[in-house]
Structure formats: C-alpha cells, structure tokens
Amino acid sequence: AQEVQQSPHCTTVPVGASVNITCSTSGGLRGIYLRQLGPQPQDIIYYEDGVVPTTDRRFRGRIDFSGSQDNLTITMHRLQLSDTGTYTCQAITEVNVYGSGTLVLVTEEQSQGWHRCSDAPPRASALPAPPTGSALPDPQTASALPDPPAASALP
C-alpha cells in the first residue's frame, strides 16, 4: 500500500526562522496537501506537478517548494508563534494517505531552551476517524475548519 514518509517528526525553531517539511511517497500521486491540525485545522498548501500551487492566505509569500509531488520539500519562512502546531501531509492517490505529522514548535528566542522536541513522532489521538477511503499508518487525520480560508485555485 502507498505510504507517506514525512520528516522531521518534530522541530523547534525561533520566531522569524524557517522550517523544512518533506513529504515522500513511492509515486503515483495526483497531488499533495499539507494540512495544519488543531482546534481549527486547515489546508496550508496543495501541490500538484505542473500546476500553480494553492497556498492559504496566511502563508502566502512565505512558502517555497522544492522537488516534485512525489518527494516534496515545503519550506515555511518567517515563522510566527501562531504557526506552532502539527502539520500533516495528505497524499491524493486512488485513496487518501496521510503522513505521520511534523510538530513545529515556534518559540521566542529566550525561551528556546524550555521547549524541546522529544524523539517520539507527533500523535493526534483525539482527532476523528479517517474517511473510509483513507490509509493511515498512525491515528492521524485531518478535519476541516468551520470558516474556510479564501484560497481558491483551479489548474
């Protein structure tokens, strides 16, 4: 079965810095979402080879991509405290396949020592069960936000 390898599991960065999240699959994708989980989970990007990526307005101008949809590195720049959270890759194949998640801890510089990543991958056990056409290696899924962002794209 198709899997999404996502790295890193966790990263601690100061305000204003950048972070790389890599989503890798064995291929055969139509595209890939990066979704931020939390009380109001939301799509951050949708990336499809040969198509202009869709980016949520909160991240416009501070996201870069390298690689292809099968092995995509997403760089988020100028991180803010509010960007702290768990980010999950959702690969679109004939089913939905999810990565294990990346916990991004954005800290004020003086408090960096207080917030450290553990080696364990992020878990999201309180989240709802995935759709039936989904494949999840971990209890990790994504729900939608009540008021969707004004991000609209059409290839």
Epitope: D43, A144, P149
Partner: antibody, heavy 117, light 107 residues
C-alpha cells in the same frame, strides 16, 4: 447510513441570488471533502464546486466569482451561495461526499433551481 | 478541460444480456475514472471508482475496465433494476467532467 439532504432551491430571476444547503448525517462530516454537482434540463452532469476537508475551495470557470461553497462543521451543513444567476444555471443541484478529490461516493436527492424572468 | 465522450445516448438490451458501455477521454486520465448510475427517479449512485474498483454494496455483475483514454462499464447479466442512465466521470484533473450519459432500456 450516510444521508445528504439538499434544500433551498426555487425560482429566481436572472441576476438574482440563492443559497443552497446540504444537511449531512451518518458521517464524520469534517473529515470529508464535499462537492456540488448539477444536472441540466438536458440531463448533462456538471461539477459546480468542491471544498476540501481543510477548507480549500475549487470551481470551474463557468461559476468562478459567482458561486461560493462553504461548510459549517459544527452543524454538518454544506452551502452553495449562488449570485448573478443566469438562465444556464437552471438545473437540479446535488451535493455529494467527495471521498478522494473527485470520487463522489454518496449523493443527495437534489434540489431544483430555476432561473427565469 | 478534459472532455468525456459517451458515443451513444441510449442502448436497448434484453434481461440477462451482457451489456458494455463505453467512455473515452480527450486525454489520458491515468485510470481516475468513475461510473455512476442514475435511476429514473433522479437518484445517483456510485458504481465503480478508479476504473475497476467496485463501490461497496454494488452487485458483482457490474465491472469496469480500461486505461489511458478508453474505459468501459460492463453489466454481465442485465436485471430489471439496472434500467437507468449511466455516466462516466474523470477526476484526474480539475475541472471534473462527466460524459453525456447512456440511457439503458429493456428491449
């Protein structure tokens, strides 16, 4: 059992507006993308709008800028706000659960929209 | 946009017949093709997804095949409840597009 029930259809004049609703039950609504599809009087099916589970919205050129899809996860309701309606928007409008970005596995019974002066 | 073509608009067959309905895409769609059944009362159901995967609860007499641009739906043993209109739909690329539909009637 998953159920989708559309409402809000009716007769509207060209240039007018209408808001359709789709009440969902029997599923974890917030976990799914959702779509609207319409069927013209000639029985052609046309995709109208989609919203991903994380809130991204997608439209064909024919309705972009006139229609807005949205969702209320607390109430398990999908919406389609339609404005600047034209006679060619006359159709039966169905909401559908979008299992995997375009794979529409459950459909409602539809609601009729007629645009006529 | 990808155009989906179902060459005939209606088809007549006898109960027990094997019926094949075709659909072609204006470009390759990598098997991202669904088949839907619409009953005379307007009810729409998914039959086949991703070219050949049978949706849950759909009788095994329905099957799908194809690749590239050419796809087909086969009903192996036509039953009275199969009287309906059948639509193909590609979901390889936005905008999602449907074929014009084939109305299946009993001889």
């Amino acid at each position: 059992e998953v159920q989708l029930v559309e409402s809000g259809g009716g007769l509207v004049k060209p240039g007018g507006s209408l808001k359709l609703s789709c009440a969902a039950s029997g599923l974890t609504f917030s976990s799914y993308a959702m779509s609207w599809v319409r069927q013209t009087p000639e029985k052609r099916l046309e995709w109208v709008a989609s919203i991903s589970s994380g809130g991204f919205t997608y439209y064909p050129d024919s309705v972009k800028g006139r229609f807005t899809i949205s969702r209320d996860n607390a109430r398990n309701i999908l919406y389609l706000q339609m404005s600047s309606l034209r006679s060619e928007d006359t159709a039966m409008y169905y909401c559908a659960r979008d299992e995997v970005r375009g794979y529409l596995d459950v459909w409602g019974a539809g609601t009729t929209v007629t645009v006529s002066s | 946009d990808i155009q989906m073509t179902q060459t005939t608009s209606s088809l007549s067959a006898s109960l027990g017949d094997r019926v094949t309905i075709s659909c072609s895409a204006s470009q390759g769609i990598s098997n991202y093709l669904n088949w839907y059944q619409q009953k005379p009362d307007g009810t729409v159901k998914l039959l086949i997804y991703y070219t050949s995967s049978l949706h849950s609860g759909v009788p095994s007499r329905f099957s799908g095949s194809g690749s590239g641009t050419d796809y087909s739906l086969t009903i192996s043993n036509l039953e009275p409840e199969d009287i309906a209109t059948y639509y193909c739909q590609q979901y390889s690329k936005l905008p999602y597009t449907f074929g014009g539909g084939i109305k299946l009637e009993i001889k």
